[in-house]
Interface confidence: low
């Protein structure tokens, strides 16, 4: 049910493209296509190509993206395009100028001197932004979100965008300086992952990150469960990045117990993050499922 045909405006097209990209990524990383039928992979790739081609219609001369060509470009949407396209680079042919042009725009046009990324044209489809919605820690949450996207595009765009390493450092400095003041578990998780990717989630920051977990297995705020699934997925990615897996099994178990298979209104971020996190887990962790089965830890075949 995650393999869907993308369509609509620059936001709706990304909503439609997300589940297919993440489903293919997950099945590739965990080598589970046999269960679903190897022949379905090609069809899924065609849908991703279609989504990619359609998304280019919403690319502006500045290389940023918006719901419509004549609408002001969105920081969040452009960062999300970068994130999805960075993952899709291994699946279909993606023009690095499209990807790195968007990265350049984010850095040159939307990053303030203190490292913060600002949003001047919020997306119309607010349901697609997940836990960033109505977030009173917006500077931290959005900066973490954009920073994660930049880090995922780093290998592809480092040569084309000279300012990328400096931009990442600056955003990391801002997150680190303000991390201890965070109140929301969601922001602790997303910013925690952004910092963990840089090797900067340690000492008191790491302690705050770990102690924010409820019952040592989830990062939870009152309200929508979808946001908690998304937040806990970011946290799992951070834990995997930290490479100390003692904290991991209860978190994975909690995510599995949610029986959240993605899809549905407002699920874009939760779907993307839960499958990205669980794919990474199966690839990285010396986990209870593979360990005593002693199944070979195969790397993706591509």
């Amino acid at each position: 049910h995650l393999i869907v045909t993308p369509s609509g405006c620059g936001e709706q097209n990304m909503i439609g493209m997300t589940p297919t990209v993440i489903a293919v990524h997950y099945l590739d990383e965990t080598e589970q296509w046999e269960k679903f039928g190897l022949e379905k992979r090609q069809g899924a790739l065609e849908l991703i190509k279609k989504g990619y081609t359609q998304q280019l219609a919403f690319r502006q001369p500045s290389s940023a993206f918006a719901a419509f060509v004549k609408r002001a470009p969105s920081t969040w949407l452009t960062a999300y395009v970068v994130k999805v396209f960075s993952l899709a680079v291994n699946l279909i042919a993606i023009d690095s100028q499209v990807l790195c042009g968007a990265v350049k725009w984010l850095i040159l046009e939307k990053q303030k001197p203190d490292g913060v990324f600002q949003e001047d044209a919020p997306v119309i489809h607010q349901e697609m932004i997940g836990g960033l919605r109505n977030n009173n820690e917006k500077d931290m949450a959005l900066t973490a979100f954009v920073l994660i996207s930049l880090q995922e595009a780093k290998d592809i765009c480092e040569e084309q965008v000279n300012s990328l390493p400096g931009s990442i450092t600056k955003a990391g400095d801002f997150l680190e300086a303000n991390y201890m003041n965070l109140q929301r578990s969601y922001t602790v998780a997303i910013a925690g992952y952004a910092l963990a990717q840089m090797g900067r989630l340690k000492g008191p920051l790491l302690n705050k990150f770990l102690t924010t977990a409820k019952d040592k297995n989830r990062w939870e705020d009152p309200g929508k469960q979808l946001y908690n699934v998304e937040a806990t997925s970011y946290a799992l990615l951070a834990l995997l990045q930290l490479k100390d897996f003692d904290f991991v099994p209860p978190v994975v178990r909690w995510l599995n117990e949610q029986r959240y298979y993605g899809g549905g209104y407002g699920s874009t971020q939760a779907t993307f993050m839960v499958f990205q996190a669980l794919a990474q887990y199966q690839k990285d962790a010396p986990d209870h499922q593979e360990l005593n089965l002693d199944v070979s830890l195969q790397l993706p075949s591509r």
Partner: antibody, heavy 111, light 112 residues
Framework: EVQLQQSGPVLVKPGASVKMSCKAS????????INWVKQSHGKSLEWIGV????????SYNQKFKGKATLTVDKSSSTAYMELNSLTSEDSAVYFC????WGQGTSVTVSS | DVLMTQTPLTLSVTIGQPASISCKSS???????????LNWLLQRPGQSPKRLIY???KLDSGVPDRFTGSGSGTDFTLKISRVEAEDLGVYYC?????????FGGGTKLEIK
């Protein structure tokens, strides 16, 4: 033939450290996790921890945290375990397994 | 930690006769993925352990089919249909569902 070849027996003084090795051959090293297990004289087995040779990720039995440090060297297909601040309680045979088992390294702590 | 209790402590069997070892866990070993991570090892005198059975009942390659594993939840059994001289040693059960992994105390199989 699949083999895990462990380093030879050691005799060390209390307070010292020891680093033992476990060299894998006959299979792709990064394809299997390496567990480390302790067997005190005439006793049962105790799980120390596990390492993922692909990326160096570890998980430890809380009891051995701070006592044991697990590492790998992918280039030589070798896993290592270092034990520090040794006492007579650490005298035992230590096995690596993947699920094949090494022959064990005997550690004796004595002044 | 999950406690693994093996009985009997020692088992004295005549060659050609059957043998049975019990292993009980203090918590269910059924994982959330529907699998049960219970393994059996044999440690022959003066040797390192060798895995015989994983996932309750799956035999490792090269393990004779006179060995069978069964059970679910918290109760597990290893059976040898006809004991041979090479089967003597200490048998251990161990669980891989919960961290930390834990082993049973062992059952020593002696030949009468």
């Amino acid at each position: 033939e699949v083999q895990l070849q462990q380093s030879g027996p050691v005799l060390v003084k209390p307070g010292a450290s020891v680093k033992m090795s476990c060299k894998a051959s006959g299979y792709t090293f990064t394809n299997y996790y390496i567990n480390w297990v302790k067997q005190s004289h005439g006793k049962s087995l105790e799980w120390i921890g596990v390492i993922n040779p692909y990326n160096g990720g570890t998980s430890y039995n809380q009891k051995f945290k701070g006592k044991a440090t697990l590492t790998v060297d992918k280039s030589s297909s070798t896993a290592y375990m270092e034990l520090n601040s040794l006492t007579s309680e650490d005298s035992a045979v230590y096995f690596c397994s993947s699920p094949y088992w090494g022959q064990g390294t005997s550690v004796t702590v004595s002044s | 930690d999950v406690l693994m209790t093996q009985t009997p402590l020692t088992l004295s069997v005549t060659i050609g006769q059957p043998a049975s070892i019990s292993c009980k866990s203090s918590q269910s070993l059924l994982d959330s993925d529907g699998k049960t991570y219970l393994n059996w090892l044999l440690q022959r005198p003066g040797q390192s352990p060798k895995r015989l059975i994983y996932l309750v009942s799956k035999l490792d390659s090269g393990v004779p089919d006179r060995f069978t594993g069964s059970g679910s939840g918290t109760d597990f059994t290893l059976k040898i249909s006809r004991v041979e001289a090479e089967d003597l040693g200490v048998y251990y059960c161990w669980q891989g569902t919960h961290f930390p992994r834990t082993f049973g105390g062992g059952t020593k199989l002696e030949i009468k």
